[in-house]
Amino acid sequence: SSPTSSASSFSSSAPFLASAVSAQPPLPDQCPALCECSEAARTVKCVNRNLTEVPTDLPAYVRNLFLTGNQLAVLPAGAFARRPPLAELAALNLSGSRLDEVRAGAFEHLPSLRQLDLSHNPLADLSPFAFSGSNASVSAPSPLVELILNHIVPPEDERQNRSFEGMVVAALLAGRALQGLRRLELASNHFLYLPRDVLAQLPSLRHLDLSNNSLVSLTYVSFRNLTHLESLHLEDNALKVLHNGTLAELQGLPHIRVFLDNNPWVCDCHMADMVTWLKETEVVQGKDRLTCAYPEKMRNRVLLELNSADLDCDPILPPSLQTS
């Protein structure tokens, strides 16, 4: 059936019908107010409607639910729990809906939920148990395969007195519920660092997007266990150099493609190993585009064109020879 707007179905001219429906389990073909539904496509779209809460009368057939561009503010526990449950719901998009709080168990009772997009919400308070649903040390496995969390960092003045990176990682790791996660996007979140334990506990990852953050170093991050990883996006960060340990780990991953564009590479003596690696590796995509940012004399030099003589470090003068 073609998408139907519920505005005509539930107008003020049918008050009895509206109240009768709200008191009973939803009819299989009804569509919530301010939404568009297509049973044939198993899709419900409640887009740019300034909704302040998740509609209660979602049709049981829904497989793809778009709740983007609203003003939801808070996603409470069991926000999508229904009787009967939304057993078919596989893809849920909540991007750009002004969510600042996602509570524990917000996505409980969605047994088929494989894709979740919370991007472009200023999540000042993401419960550690938002995705696991319980505070048990080992939770029931989440069905999530794709988790999209791009640009969920709140404005600085709205952040709690805790590390934003820590808050997000706590939610990713709680109860080991996301062991089956294959795609994780964390782009544009001002991440300064990646907690060292996060990747080790997401062994099924195929795609990891950390682009457009503020990562300075990967020294304490281990990719060794991510044997299924196919793409690693590190573009537009603050990376200065990749050290031997990281190079070896990336080189050994059997399916990997790495994206490193637009980082402020420091082309001094510490860059020698990375340049040697870049000249031979096939895992870095677009490696011929990587250029030096520092020191000033090296700015815009192509990394692949450097040789060891180019990569020097200014000698450290003993204190007696230093000038003020």
Epitope: E230, Q251, G252, H255, R257, F259, E282, V283, Q285
Partner: antibody, heavy 122, light 111 residues
Framework: EVQLVESGGGLVQPGGSLRLSCAAS????????MSWVRQAPGKGLEWVGF??????????EYSASVKGRFTISRDNSKSSLYLQMNSLKTEDTAVYYC?????????????WGQGTLVTVSS | EIVLTQSPGTLSLSPGERATLSCRAS??????????LQWYQQKPGQAPRLLIY???NVESGIPDRFSGSGSGTDFTLTISRLEPEDIAVYFC?????????FGGGTKVEIK
Amino acid sequence: EVQLVESGGGLVQPGGSLRLSCAASGFTFTDYYMSWVRQAPGKGLEWVGFIRNKGNGYTTEYSASVKGRFTISRDNSKSSLYLQMNSLKTEDTAVYYCARYRGNPHYAMDYWGQGTLVTVSS
Amino acid sequence: EIVLTQSPGTLSLSPGERATLSCRASESVEFYGTSFLQWYQQKPGQAPRLLIYGASNVESGIPDRFSGSGSGTDFTLTISRLEPEDIAVYFCQQSRKVPSTFGGGTKVEIK
């Protein structure tokens, strides 16, 4: 399911030309390096060359024995790989296999086609 | 180019026996901690089939009687208990440097 199907083999005279095709399916073609490997009758395997993926600009590498005579190309809209063979010699007679490199190409080829026979003879 | 030498040329064993195939490289095939050496199985009239990658990683779907070992320049493919369906030619291949090269092959046959 990954599938590679070669075609275009046949009998050609020395000095002639032939174009082999490989139709790929079951994976995102532009993400992968693709290669040609050949095997002369009763002999071992010989790497002919590869073409890189989108991220690495679809550039090519060849073995010394075919460089300047053979050209590997790809039509990504058709998920097809090609081998244009010019100035053919009798020693180019072989079964030609199309193969997909693993995501990390350093680990070489994980899927192969069944091959197409090229015979260069007068 | 890197030359790979396989031995023996032919290996005749009874079913259930252990098969040990060797591949030696003319220079190291190691790069940043990984040896880029593969083993392929080819049965008559068929395309090669990947068994082992990175010297010791068993490709998915390959029986666990196949294993690979070695690093640097010396590598071994082991079939722990030979089965009749393992009759084939086995090739090693290095992908450390362009051009990629193959060994001459070891033919495994049943005695």
